[in-house]
Structure formats: C-alpha cells, structure tokens
Interface confidence: medium
C-alpha cells in the first residue's frame, strides 16, 4: 500500500493509492487531505481525530458506505468536504454537527433516497456551496431538508428521479446566488419556481425534458424577484412549450440574461407568444446566448418573424454552433438595440451574409463575430459589412480565406480585426489602416511589412517569423505577442525602436544564444517588466551545449565571446 505525499504547507495527496481505510499517521499539521479514488468503505470515529487543523477533506469516489456518527467530531476547522460519488445510502445529521466552519459540502452521487429523517444542516451557518442528489434514487425533496440554511452562494440539486417536491421546501433559503437543478421532467418546475422566485439570482436548469411543460399562474403574491439570469442546459423544448416558458417571465421582471446550451428544439420555430404583455416583460433581457442548439428539422425552420418584437431591446446575442446559415434581413432590421452578435461555428457564406447585413440591419452593432463559418473572400466580406456604420470590432477568424487582394473596403469605424487561423500566408494593404488591434495568430506568415499607423496591439503568435517586425511599421504599438514563431534573437536596438512598447510576449521561439543576446539579457534586468512569461518561456535552441537552458541562466563561454 502506497503512502500519502504531503508538501511543506500541509497539503496531502492520497488519490488512487488503493487505500482500504483512512491511512494511519495523520497529524495536526495537515491542512488538506485528498483521498479520492480509493477503496476505503468505512470511516471510524477515531480515523480523523488527529486532523484538528484540517481545512479541506476530499473523499470523492472512495467506495465509502459507512461513516460513524462522530467520525468528523475533531474537524471544527474544516471548510471543504467532498463525499461525492460514494456508496452512502443514508445521511446522518450527526456527521455535520461539529463542522461549524464548513463552507463547501458535496454529497452528490450517493444512493440515498432522501436527505435523512432530520435536518442535516442546521449547524452549517457558514455554508456557501452545497451539492446534493443523484441520478437514480434521490426521489423526494422535503420541507425539513434545508432547515437552518438561510443563504448560499451555490446550490446544486441532482434530482433526475424526483417523485415528490413538498411545496415551500426551498423557500426557507432566503438568498441563493446560483441554483442548479437537474430535473428530468418539468413536473415539479412550477412549484419549485414559485418557491425560489424571491431568493435565486441565477437559475440553471439541466437535462430537463420541457416538451410537456404547461404554464399555470403561480400561487405567489406580487414578488420582486432578484433573478437576473436563467439558463437551460441539455433541455428539450417544443414550439408550444417555448411559448409556455415565456409566460414565466412575467414573474422575473429583472431578468437580464437567458442562455440555452446543448438544447434540442423539436419544432420549427413556429413560436407564437400569445400574451401581448410578454413583449414588455422581456424589456430588461439584454443578453441571449444559444450554443449547440439541435433542431432535428432545421431545414424546415421558420423565419422567426413571430419573435421579432421580443428581441428589439436585446443588446447581446450569441448563437454558436447551431447550423445558422441566414439571419433574414427583416429580422436583422428589427434588432435595433443589438450591440454584440456572435455567430461562431455556423454555416454563414457571403451570399447569405449579404442578406443578413442588408441596409438598415443591426443599426447599433459594434461587435460582430463570424469565427469558423464558411467565408472565403475577405474582400467580399468587408464590402458586405459596409452597411454596419457602427461596427468597431470584427472577428472572422477560423475561416479559410482565399489570398487577400491589395485593396479592400471595410466599415469606417472598424478598429479591431481578428484574422487568426485563416490560413493567410501574406498580409497586404487589404487590411485597413484604421486598426488599433490586429490578430493574425496561427497562420503561415513568414514576414509582416504592413504600415499600420494606429496599431496598438499586434497578435502574431504561432506563425513563421524569423525576426521581430520592423518597429517603424507601428509607431504607437503598446503590445506585441509573437510566441511560437522562429525568432532567433532580439536586441537592445530592436526593442528600443518601439517607442511605446509596454508588453512583449516572445516566448517559445528558437533563440540562438549568441554572445550579444546573452549579454543583452544579463545587462537588462528591466526585461522582466516588458517580457511576458520571462524567464521560463525563453529558452536557448542553440548552440547545442545551451539547448533547453533559460536565457536568463545561460552563460556564454569566455572563449567564444572574447576572441
């Protein structure tokens, strides 16, 4: 049997050591103990008694099925306890009585059906994070379960087999910053929603089939709900249930952000928000995020004209990796307040982009992200976007562009352009001179000789440059990131010729540790203030005797340098 490894600060690692019991020899010097992925099965009353100063105890996936009632009695300083993914079929309030300092408790993934016959947590007045429940057996949430808890930063409940929710069970917790609920069906959603309206600021619903969700007025008085964010992850919706969900918004008037991740819409986008007051109640929603939305019949999808008015006040929209090939012109024109639009990882091509960015489209748009679509012509893309009079930032990275021409047109206010991972080999005057930030990372550039008088930040890492670009090209440059190129040296003269340079990230290049370079680095301790990741990322590539040495540590041979 292997033993623990502990560092000087009392952090002890005993993960995956095949322990069959809590190891002996634990001491009061231990601050953190991780015994995850073992075969401990049983924790006796004296097993942890020596650990009076323990602050972190992690017992994840250790096959524990029995814990004596007073096993944790000496752990008054414990702040973090993880008992997740064990075999605890029942929970005891006596375990937690002594743990008055506890801030984090994870009981998830154990096969209990309820949280126990009495309240588990009345003494945990400092608790900030609580994770409970499991996939198969946790079936009932009761009013006694959360007694004594008044405020939590995070509460996560995995209740995919929930058979009953006693009304007002969650109401006793007056303030929950982030509540994550794993519910397989929408059956208890209305009750739970009613109980958390006045306490939860961010509600995240996971793995829920909402296809049969039906709204009914909630049995609540007028509440001023603090909820600012609502997220659905791995949920299944239909056109009808989406309409029903919208009706919940009348109870959360301060909602500012809605998110759908990895959801499936079994519908055609035939939304019909029947309640006219829904429109005004969406008034404070500023951010809508949709990632990896799966629409089995996406080829039959509607034009969304029924929700145009819902989105007129939204400022930030992300629809990522969801097979978007067109935002209809009329929809774009309705997005009057939109300042940020991210359509990364979709199917946009120039022909349809032209329709999306029609005259009057996205009149307030400042940032457009079209990363990893199917754009091919930089020239055509710039021309299409001339309609966007307020556009300052454009990300067209991860598109495979044809070689750029000498001349292109771009929106006149554009200051930021991301062309990273676009396969470009040469930069030409197609790139606008108005830019303040340019990202051409991860391309095939072996030189950069474009004059950009306003450029303040240049990102050119992961290319093939052998030297730093000429400083005269960028008179006001503040930041240059040129990692992972083939730069062999830099000198005092080179760096000195960038009059305003504050940050240079040039690590992981192929430095030739010549007498000049090593002398310069030895004589210039101030390099540490300019060079990011100095000294660890700055290694000699040659000569062979210094290969792998840090520039800072490498010493030139007296013979070589004083001939």
């Amino acid at each position: 049997q292997e033993s623990l490894s502990c560092d000087a600060s009392g952090v002890c690692d005993g993960r995956s050591r095949s322990f069959t019991s809590i190891p002996s020899g634990l001491t009061a010097a231990m601050k953190s103990l991780d015994l995850s992925f073992n075969k401990i099965t049983y924790i006796g009353h004296g097993d942890l008694r020596a650990c009076a100063n323990l602050q972190v105890l992690i017992l994840k996936s250790s096959r524990i099925n029995t814990i004596e009632g007073d096993a944790f009695y000496s752990l008054g300083s414990l702040e973090h306890l993880d008992l997740s993914d064990n075999h605890l079929s029942s929970l005891s309030s006596s375990w937690f009585g002594p743990l008055s300092s506890l801030k984090y408790l994870n009981l998830m993934g154990n096969p209990y059906q309820t949280l126990g016959v009495t309240s588990l947590f009345p003494n945990l007045t400092n608790l900030q994070t609580l994770r409970i429940g499991n996939v198969e057996t946790f079936s009932e949430i009761r009013r006694i379960d959360f007694a004594g808890l008044t405020s939590l930063n995070e509460l996560e409940i995995k209740a995919l087999s929930l058979r009953n929710y006693q009304s007002q069970s969650l109401k006793s917790i007056r303030d929950i910053h982030h509540l994550t609920l794993h519910l397989s069906e929408s059956a208890f959603l209305l009750e739970i929603f009613a109980d958390i309206l006045s306490s939860v600021r961010y509600l995240e619903l996971r793995d829920t089939n909402l296809a049969r969700f039906q709204f009914s007025p909630l049995p609540v008085d007028e509440v001023s709900s603090p909820m600012k964010k609502l997220a659905f992850r791995g949920s299944v919706l239909t056109d009808e249930s989406f309409n029903e969900l919208l009706k919940l918004l009348r109870y959360i008037l301060e909602l500012s952000e809605v998110e759908f991740d990895d959801c499936t819409l079994n519908g055609l986008g035939d939304f019909n928000p029947s309640e006219s007051d829904v429109v005004s109640e969406l008034g404070k929603v500023e951010t809508v995020t949709i990632r990896r939305l799966h629409i089995p019949q996406f080829y039959l999808f509607y034009d969304l004209s029924t929700v145009y008015s819902l989105l007129e006040k939204v400022k930030r929209i992300t629809v990522e990796n969801s097979k978007v090939f067109l935002v209809p012109c009329s929809f774009s024109q309705h997005l009057k307040s939109l300042e940020f639009l991210d359509l990364s990882e979709n199917l946009m091509v120039e022909e349809y982009l032209k329709n999306s960015a029609c005259k009057g489209a996205w009149p307030s748009l400042q940032t457009l992200v079209l990363s990893q679509n199917h754009l091919r012509s930089m020239q055509k893309t710039g021309e299409i976007l001339l309609t966007l009079k307020n556009l300052t930032s454009l990300d067209i990275s991860r598109n495979t562009f044809h070689p750029m021409p000498d001349s292109c047109q771009w929106p006149e206010k554009m200051r930021f352009l991301n062309l990273s991972s676009t396969g470009i080999r040469v930069v030409k005057t197609c790139i606008p001179q108005t830019l303040e930030v340019l990202d051409v990372s991860n391309n095939n550039l072996d030189s950069f000789s474009l004059f950009l008088p306003r450029l303040q930040e240049l990102y050119i890492s992961r290319n093939k440059l052998k030297t730093l670009p000429d400083a005269s090209l960028f008179p006001v440059l503040l930041v240059m990131k040129i990692r992972e190129n083939a730069v062999s040296t830099f000198s005092k003269d080179q760096l000195g010729s960038f009059p305003k340079l504050e940050t240079l990230e040039a690590g992981d290049n192929h430095f030739v540790c010549s007498c000049e370079l090593l002398s310069f680095t030895m004589e210039t301790p101030a390099l540490a203030q300019i060079l990011v990741d100095w000294p660890d990322s700055y290694l000699c590539d040659s000569p062979p005797r210094l290969h792998g040495h840090r520039l800072q540590d490498a010493r030139p041979s007296v013979l070589e340098c004083h001939q």
Epitope: E140, R142, N164, S167, Q214, F215, P219
Partner: nanobody, 124 residues
Framework: EVQLVESGGGLVQAEGSLRLSCVAS????MGWFRQASGKEREFVAA??????????DSADSAKGRFTISRDNAKNTVYLQMTSLKPEDTGVYYC???????????????????WGQGTQVTVSS
C-alpha cells in the same frame, strides 16, 4: 372546474377508525385538511399523482395514525384514520391543486379546488 365530493365522515368512539373518500373529476395532487370549531384550517395529508405522500412535520400530528392513498383508476383519494382521539374532531376537507402542479403542499392557498367538507366527531 374540478368537482370534489367527500364521504365517510361520522361519529366514532375514541381509538376507533374511519376511512374518508374523495372523488375528483381528474387526477390531481390532492390533500386533506381539517378545521376544528373556531380554529384555522390545518393540513392533514397530501398525495401526488404518482403516489408520493406528505404529512405534517410536527411530532404531535396525525402522522403514523393517518394514511393517505389513491386509486387513480377511480379518481379517488382516501384518508384512513386509526386510533382516533377527541382532538381529531372537525370538518375534513378534500382539496385539489390545479392540473399543472405536481408537488404536494401543506399550504391551503396552494389548493385551487375544495370539497364541501365532511364532519368527523370523535367521542370519548
């Protein structure tokens, strides 16, 4: 509108038993409440659609003596009362939550539909 019809009340000796029935027009979360003369309506038991039950938390309640059950095929909910005491005397009401609610509740305000009540009198 959900119609609720209670039956089974009556006069019974202390330590005796009674079974109350409530027929509903539909399958809902159902509850039994009671009201003694001059007192507030008090939660007795509740049952959800799948048969999970809920009783009052307090130790001196009827839990252990009273059992709620349902027969969905007959749209009927039962309250089996044993070891009855004089303090169990009162009007027993059957209540139903709206169709879209699935969780049990001990709060009268969460129930939208109510029966007319059936009198239970326990003599000593």
């Amino acid at each position: 509108e959900v119609q609720l019809v209670e039956s089974g009340g009556g006069l019974v000796q202390a330590e005796g038993s009674l079974r109350l029935s409530c027929v509903a027009s539909g399958t809902h979360v159902m509850g039994w409440f009671r009201q003694a003369s001059g007192k507030e309506r008090e939660f007795v038991a509740a049952i959800n659609r799948s048969g999970s039950t809920d009783y009052p938390d307090s130790a001196d309640s009827a839990k252990g003596r009273f059992t709620i059950s349902r027969d969905n095929a007959k749209n009927t909910v039962y309250l089996q009362m044993t070891s009855l005491k004089p303090e169990d005397t009162g009007v027993y009401y059957c209540a139903a939550r709206k169709a879209f609610y699935f969780g049990t509740s001990s709060y009268p305000s969460d129930y939208a539909y109510w029966g007319q009540g059936t009198q239970v009198t326990v003599s000593s």
